[in-house]
């Protein structure tokens, strides 16, 4: 059986202030099981913008019922973009854990940039 | 009931150092980045440094930058603030304040921490 | 860097009257303006976010509005209790995060 495979299809997505950001995500396998958190950045400063598991993320919308059985599509979408939102977004896929889920793979981002709003 | 409750204030004389704790319950910790704002005697707001939700990215207001630092416990749900070389001009009530999203407006605060530095 | 600016400073309100209070900014910050309440010796308290959207439990009495520069918080018919100072907060551009210097609401 392949290793699961994060892939993020857009390199690059531009979005006026104030519009919405649609960032793809897709999972080639639902093994091994864990959740999907998307970040904005890498490394330590990296920013969380969704867990799958927990927390409340008011801007942020599952373009797909992730809960539904056999869902591989990750996408989101974030509600009324500011020029703070622009970055590159990955897409990780955790694997579960006790304590601790363990990242398990990381898609090659999506770079999102902001224009200005059209006066 | 999201609750953020501050300790370790007290009166220290310039130069010496101060750590102030931000004990949170009622929340997913780990999910939110956090921030520290004071406010000095019959002053208004002034917002300090804010720690991301991994604790790996942090910002400073340059009035405090390289003296104090940010961090945070998510397996404690606690936040630190470290103040070193402290000053009479930072004399302030402490508040530490939880972001709504990772780019966001401060809606939760703490009741404060009083800090006065005075020889 | 992103200058809020409040106004009046001071403002002097009859129970049961209207109280308008101003916000502006140096540069357009979208919709992204909050409002926090802060009475005498207690912490700040979340208002209005997103400009016009009320935080939970705040009363309907206080309402939000603006966009880009221009901002006003109006408290419709102000009760003794909202004596206090009432900050603006901008998170379109940051760090830092600003707030602006406060508008004190006094009961006449």
């Known amino acids: 059986e392949d290793e699961l495979q994060v892939i993020q299809p857009e390199k690059s997505v531009s979005v006026a202030a104030g519009e919405s950001a649609t960032l793809r995500c897709a999972m080639t396998s639902l093994i091994p099981v864990g959740p999907i958190m998307w970040f904005r950045g890498a490394g330590a400063g990296r920013e969380l913008i969704y867990n799958q598991k927990e927390g409340h993320f008011p801007r942020v919308t599952t373009v797909s019922e992730l809960t539904k059985r056999n869902n591989l599509d990750f996408s989101i979408s974030i509600s009324n973009i500011t020029p703070a939102d622009a970055g590159t977004y990955y897409c990780v896929k955790f694997r579960k854990g006790s304590p601790d889920d363990v990242e398990f793979k990381s898609g090659a981002g999506t770079e999102l940039s902001v224009r200005a709003k059209p006066s | 009931d999201v609750q953020l409750v501050e300790s370790g204030g007290g009166v220290v004389r310039p130069g010496e150092s101060l750590r102030l704790s931000c004990a949170a319950s009622?929340?997913?910790?780990?999910?939110?980045?956090m921030n520290w704002v004071r406010q000095a005697p019959g002053e208004g707001l002034e917002w300090v440094s804010r720690?991301?939700?991994?604790?790996?990215?942090?910002d400073y207001a340059e009035s405090v930058k390289g003296r104090f630092t940010i961090s945070r416990d998510n397996s404690e749900n606690t936040l630190y603030l470290q103040m070193n070389s402290l000053r009479a001009e930072d004399t302030a009530v402490y508040y530490c304040?939880?972001?709504?999203?990772?780019?966001?407006?401060?809606?939760?605060w703490g009741l404060g921490a009083l800090v006065t530095v005075s020889s | 860097e992103t200058v809020l600016t409040q106004s009046p400073a001071t403002l002097s309100v009859s129970p049961g009257e209207r109280a308008t209070l101003s916000c502006r900014a140096s540069?357009?910050?979208?919709?992204?303006l909050a409002w926090h309440q802060q009475k005498p010796g207690q912490a700040p308290r979340l208002l209005i976010y997103?400009?016009?959207r009320r935080a939970t439990g705040i009363p309907d009495r206080f309402s939000g509005s603006g966009s880009g520069t221009d901002f006003t918080l109006t408290i419709s018919s102000l009760q003794t209790e909202d004596s206090a100072v009432y900050y603006c907060?901008?998170?379109?551009?940051?760090?830092?995060?600003?707030f602006g210097g406060g508008t004190k609401v006094e009961i006449k």
């Open positions: 720690i991301n939700s991994g604790g790996g990215g942090t």
């Open positions: 540069q357009t910050v979208g919709s992204k």
């Open positions: 907060q901008q998170y379109y551009y940051w760090p830092p995060y600003r």
């Open positions: 997103d400009a016009s």
């Open positions: 304040a939880k972001q709504y999203d990772w780019n966001g407006f401060f809606d939760y």
């Open positions: 009622g929340f997913s910790f780990s999910s939110y980045a």
